[in-house]
């Protein structure tokens, strides 16, 4: 019940092997790992097709799979203690060999939301249907099986082995047999690409022991990203066949000499490589060696090439790939610089806006300008900020320090202001006297006056009306007598003196802020300007990127 029959497909820089045998996911991963691989990833539709091909190869050889549905482990797992995450394409699962999550997925059905047990993914094959590229195997999630109890395990698994490069298959110019042995211990006589470090055994002849000659080759890295066998000329050539056997093993043209010998040649625009078999384009750019948006530029006489990057990008150490230039390293902005792919943009601190001499310059925002002042009364602009002040008789108030509130001088902590009665008004106060007393010229003391039964003298009339316009806390005038020890009205309430300084308490905001400011509590977005190269002007991302999308499929997260 180990891993039995296997099939292999090599493409790009990876080989996929398919195995039958009832193993748990852990045992299957261990089997792949022993040979230097992992359970396979399926990160794209193309990769899904490669995996499907290797499974089709396995199923052609494997008569034992009689079940209608068959499952094969791949390297997608969710650890114990990690809940399903429906907002992600991989639903909280991850590839066992590591690597980034990719958007491709092909789930068989809505997943069960579980958090407790480890969950593993297998490819679900319907063996009653032909395997078509348009009908790729679905992903099925379930328990990971138990080592040593085949009943709980599934039919097989797929491994993936990655390599730095591949050699072309060896071309035979006459009868013979090639056997490739890969670094992951698979032997095959038909690979469309042969992985780096594979060995090739070539037995020439038609089976006659006398005529058999053997050759041994190794797939080596001849130059960076160039892999070949180190062989020269077609193998197993025979004058008996000339160019008639497998085109003499030649990649393109085969030219016969009169003596049964032959040579390989290439079509116009191509040149023969050192193996004397393979043809490559004379234009080195035809193989698209440049990556990441780089353009391939032919060198003089079309012999070599260089890669060129678009504005805002530069070549990396391989000289083949483009990476973003961090223009902010050169401090091109007066205040804040934000690097963007292929460019950058300048931002101004809160309290500043784009403007002034030079690119990326910032100028102070005059928060106190007509029509935009956030202050209820006085406003003083400062560099990058502002502060509010209040008129006499008012103090700054409000959470953000932009409002003004009347000071009730009649109840302040400064002791008696009036000898008798005190009347608070908007921004001021007045003294008054009890019946039978009159206010002295100093406006504070009371002197005995003619007996009168009228109201207390001195309440304010309309003289203050509108004195403190802009105050957000209007108050009615109030008389505040204080009781004396015997219960009779005492001369005055305790009040505070009016402030004689109009700029007394002020609120200021720090100059440099990348957080909301202005006056505290007044939010302003950073100003943005000056974009270069690939990036146009953009607002900083608003809203909340972490808000997940609403899913209403009503499935309650079933398996």
């Amino acid at each position: 019940t180990g891993a039995d029959t296997e099939a292999v497909v090599c493409v790009g820089t990876a080989c996929y092997t398919a195995h039958s045998g009832k193993l748990s996911a852990a045992e299957a991963q261990n089997h792949c790992n022993q040979n230097g691989g992992n359970l396979a990833t399926v990160k794209s539709k193309e990769e899904a097709q490669h995996v499907q091909r290797v499974l089709a190869q396995l199923l052609r050889r494997e008569a034992a799979l009689t079940a209608r549905m068959s499952k094969f482990w791949i390297g997608l797992q969710r650890e114990k203690g990690k809940c399903l995450d429906p907002s992600l394409p991989l639903k909280g699962f991850s590839w066992v060999g590591g690597g980034e999550d990719t958007p491709y997925s092909n789930w068989h059905k809505e997943l069960r939301n579980s958090c407790i047990s480890k969950r593993c993914v297998s490819l679900l094959l319907d063996l009653s249907q032909p395997l078509l590229p348009s009908r790729l195997p679905k992903w099925s999630e379930g328990p990971c099986g138990s080592p040593g109890s085949p009943g709980s395990n599934i039919e097989g698994f797929v491994c993936k082995f990655s390599f730095k490069g591949m050699c072309r298959p060896l071309a035979l110019g006459g009868p013979g047999q090639v056997t490739y042995t890969t670094p992951f211990q698979t032997t095959s006589s038909s690979l469309e690409a042969v992985p780096f470090a594979s060995a090739a055994n070539v037995a020439c002849g038609e089976g006659d022991k006398d005529e058999t000659q053997s050759h041994y080759f190794l797939c080596k890295e001849k130059a960076p990203d160039v892999f070949d066998w180190g062989s020269s000329g077609p193998l197993c050539v025979s004058p008996k066949y000339g160019c008639n056997f497998n085109n003499g093993g030649c990649h393109q043209d085969c030219f016969e000499g009169g003596d049964g010998s032959f040579l390989c040649g290439c079509r116009p625009g191509f040149r023969l490589l050192d193996d004397l078999v393979t043809c490559a384009s004379r234009n080195p750019c035809s193989s698209s060696p440049c990556r990441g948006g780089a353009t391939c530029v032919l060198g003089p006489h079309g012999k070599n090439y260089t890669c060129r990057c678009p504005q805002g990008y530069q070549l990396d150490s391989s000289q083949l790939d483009c990476v973003d230039v961090d223009e902010c390293q050169d401090s091109p902005c007066a205040q804040e610089c934000v690097n963007t792919p292929g460019g950058f943009r300048c931002e101004c601190w809160v309290g500043y806006e784009p403007g002034g001499p030079g690119e990326g310059a910032c100028q102070d925002v005059d928060e106190c300008a007509l029509g935009r002042s956030p202050c209820a009364q006085g406003c003083t602009n400062t560099d990058g900020s502002f502060h509010c002040s209040c008129e006499e008789g008012y103090v700054l108030a409000g959470e953000d320090g932009t409002q003004c509130q009347d000071v009730d001088e009649c109840v302040g902590p400064g002791g008696p202001l009036c000898d008798s009665l005190c009347f608070n008004t908007q921004g001021s106060f007045h003294c008054g006297c009890l019946p039978g007393w009159v206010l002295a010229p100093n406006g504070v003391s009371c002197t005995m006056g003619p007996v009168s039964l009228g109201p207390p003298s001195g309440p304010p009339d309309e003289e203050d009306k509108g004195e403190k316009e802009g105050s957000t806390v209007p108050r009615a005038a109030t008389a505040s007598p204080t009781r004396g020890p015997e219960g009779t009205p005492k001369a005055t309430p305790t009040t505070s003196r009016p402030s004689l300084s109009s700029d007394a308490p002020i609120t200021s905001a720090p100059l440099k802020m990348l957080a909301p400011s202005g006056s505290p509590g007044v939010w302003r977005e950073p100003s943005i300007h000056h974009a270069t190269a690939a990036s146009g002007p953009q607002e900083p991302a608003g809203g909340d990127s972490s808000v997940a999308t609403q899913n209403n499929d009503g499935t309650d997260g079933q398996k």
Epitope: K80, G81, K82, C83, L84, D85, P86, S87, L88, G92, R112, N113, S114, C115, I116, S117, K118, P143, S546, A548, T549, Q550, N551, D556, G557, Q558, K559
Partner: antibody, heavy 115, light 109 residues
């Protein structure tokens, strides 16, 4: 429709054990985890633990390790929670709830621990 | 163990939109916390509303929605109805256990 039917109220002595049951119907029992939660006036809702009936895998709140044991019987579609070494602090209403999203709840079992 | 905090009480009017939040003492709530929202009506009747941050349970009206707002999980009732008066609990998953919040008593006047 989905139903979780819990066993009846229990009056138990301090130090004793009790086994509560939660019978599931209206869905495939092994398709969803079963979680257990208790409610008291002092601590509100407390998650005790959960079980995956398909694999028997469990997870527990550290506070209830050694106090609660969760099991599941696939043949009868019933989840069980055994509570041992009971004290007056364990007097509560105990609930089973289906799946890690707590979509469906049983009616609750009142457990009273009293001498 | 982590502490999960909810508003103790909120009041809304029929037809209004109200948002209940759920904060974690360990930092920002993310989708890996798999936030669940549960409604408790009188006589200990519990109903699951939202699971896994933003998935409505079967049969739950569309006016209930779950999301992440800033560093908290949120339950929004768009157009509250008098029958939505209840206690709402959130529960967050922390790698191997759930922790419930203290509940929010929602009054619909």
């Amino acid at each position: 429709q989905v139903q979780l039917q819990q066993s009846g109220a229990e009056l138990v002595r301090p130090g004793a054990s009790v086994k509560l049951s939660c019978k599931a119907s209206g869905y495939t029992f092994t398709d969803y985890e079963m979680h257990w939660v208790r409610q008291t006036p002092v601590h509100g809702l407390e998650w005790i633990g959960g079980i995956d009936p398909e694999t028997g895998g469990t997870a527990y709140n550290q506070k209830f390790k050694g106090k609660a044991t969760l099991t599941a019987d696939k043949s009868s579609s019933t989840a069980y929670m055994e509570l041992r070494s009971l004290t007056s602090e364990d007097s509560a209403v105990y609930y089973c709830t289906r799946g890690a999203w707590f979509a469906y709840w049983g009616q609750g079992t009142l457990v009273t621990v009293s001498a | 163990q982590a502490v999960v905090t909810q508003e103790s009480a909120l009041t809304t009017s029929p037809g209004e939109t109200v948002t209940l939040t759920c904060r974690s003492s360990t930092g920002a709530v993310t989708t890996s916390n798999s936030a669940n929202w549960v409604q408790e009506k009188p006589d200990h009747l519990f109903t699951g509303l939202i699971g896994g941050t933003n998935n409505r349970a079967p049969g739950v009206p569309a006016r209930f929605s779950g999301s992440l707002i800033g560093d908290k999980a949120a339950l929004t009732i768009t157009g509250a109805q008098t029958e939505d008066e209840a206690i709402y609990f959130c529960a967050l998953w922390y790698n191997n256990h759930f922790v419930f919040g203290g509940g929010t008593k929602l009054t619909v006047l």
